[in-house]
């Protein structure tokens, strides 16, 4: 499956939007750093089938969308930037969904990759729990924004590696 050229541009735009969402200096939030236990092994493509990688990427973007579309995120972050971010993520999801259909086929279920998808979901659960425990403070959002930028960058790297294998 060939992801459209606009897909990688969308990735870059999403990262830029995440960077622009910064509300306070991160230097004031060093104490709030947290280990969210990013599921790195799910992004190491050594033993990955392409279909599995696409499913994991889709889950990653879906969970990012869910995280940033809550009431609390709307209250803490710039709404204009969030709206643009949703548009970019929505486009990413559409591109990946088309790919999943081509790679996996309708017969195969995403449940084949349940463990990988579950690892991504648990990662986002840890992020949500952290935000809840920190009462959605400005610093908590700053830490989460930095974490999502990092995981998003790793997702982009995986997509690049998949593209280079084609």
């Amino acid at each position: 499956c060939d992801l459209p050229q606009t897909h990688s541009l969308g990735n870059r735009r999403a990262l830029i939007l995440l960077a622009q969402m910064r509300r306070i200096s991160p230097f004031s939030c060093l104490k709030d750093r947290h280990d969210f236990e990013f599921p790195q092994e799910e992004f190491d493509d050594k033993q990955f089938q392409k279909a599995q990688a696409i499913s994991v990427l889709h889950e990653m973007i879906q969970q990012t969308f869910n995280l940033f579309s809550t009431k609390d995120s709307s209250a803490a972050l710039d709404e204009t930037l969030l709206d643009e971010f949703y548009i970019e993520l929505d486009q990413q999801l559409n591109d990946l969904e088309s790919c999943v259909m081509q790679e996996v086929g309708v017969i195969e279920s995403p449940l084949m990759y349940e463990d990988s998808i579950l690892a991504v979901r648990k990662y986002f659960q840890r992020i949500t729990l952290y935000l809840t425990e920190k009462k959605y403070s400005s610093c908590a959002w700053e830490v989460v924004r930095a974490e999502i930028m990092r995981s998003f960058s790793l997702s982009i790297n995986l997509q690049k590696r998949l593209k280079s294998k084609e």
């Epitope: 709030d32 974490e147 960058s153």
Partner: antibody
């Protein structure tokens, strides 16, 4: 391969200005902060300050606030440390090192080779 | 500011010895403690981060432990290349601070 390459040794006179550099390569320069560390002859390590190259936000150690200026040019993946008026007590080795910012990842995992600054009349 | 106090400031040991260096923070630093090795004329090298995680490429004879305010760097069997100065450093809060260093010399 991740690298931080610093500018060469400098010999200056008291009262002169100086700007030393630290060029990052092999990684996304704006994804990491760059810290500066001083080591005076025969002494230990002292943290001076840090910069987020993505927007040039800075934080300084109280001991160095107002004494030095940290800046960055993300277009050329370079961070700078500068003095407007050097003193003999600024004679030291200066290191830059990268920091993962708010991410839970190893701190100061890569260091520059150091820039020796000698201030003498 | 968080003060970092290392002990001892220097020690003499032989190849094969087990060496322990301690670092105490003036307040809790939530395990955000790093250990560096520095050899004369060289830049510091990260050995241990977050109190106990071994940095990639660092020999397993190096280990870190501790929490709260008290931390330890252990070299299980000292090798000739381990004679150097070791520094602890906290990254819990600004200003970031280093210990004064521990010089490990040949007995």
């Amino acid at each position: 391969e991740v690298q931080l390459v610093q500018s060469g040794a400098e010999v200056k006179k008291p009262g002169e200005s100086l700007k030393i550099s630290c060029k990052g390569s092999g990684y996304s320069f704006t994804s990491y902060w760059i810290g500066w560390v001083r080591q005076m002859p025969g002494k230990g390590l002292e943290w001076m300050g840090i910069i987020d190259p993505s927007d040039s936000d800075t934080a300084y150690s109280p001991s160095f606030q107002g004494q030095v200026t940290i800046s960055a040019d993300k277009s050329i993946s370079t961070a700078y440390l500068q003095w407007s008026s050097l003193k003999a007590s600024d004679t030291a080795m200066y290191y830059c090192a990268r920091h993962p910012g708010l991410n839970w990842a190893p701190d100061f995992d890569y260091w520059g080779q150091g820039t020796l600054v000698t201030v003498s009349s | 500011d968080i003060q970092m106090t290392q002990s001892p400031s220097s020690l003499s040991a032989s190849v094969g010895d087990r060496v322990t260096i301690t670092c105490r923070a003036s307040q809790s630093i939530n395990g955000v403690l790093n250990w560096y090795q520095q050899k004369p004329g060289k830049a510091p090298k990260l050995l241990i981060y977050f109190a106990s995680s071994l940095q990639s490429g660092v020999p397993s004879r190096f280990s870190g432990s501790g929490s709260g305010t008290d931390f330890t760097l252990t070299i299980s069997s000292l090798q000739p290349e381990d004679f150097a100065t070791y520094y602890c450093q906290q990254s819990h809060d600004f200003p970031l601070t280093f210990g004064q260093g521990t010089k490990v010399e040949i007995k």
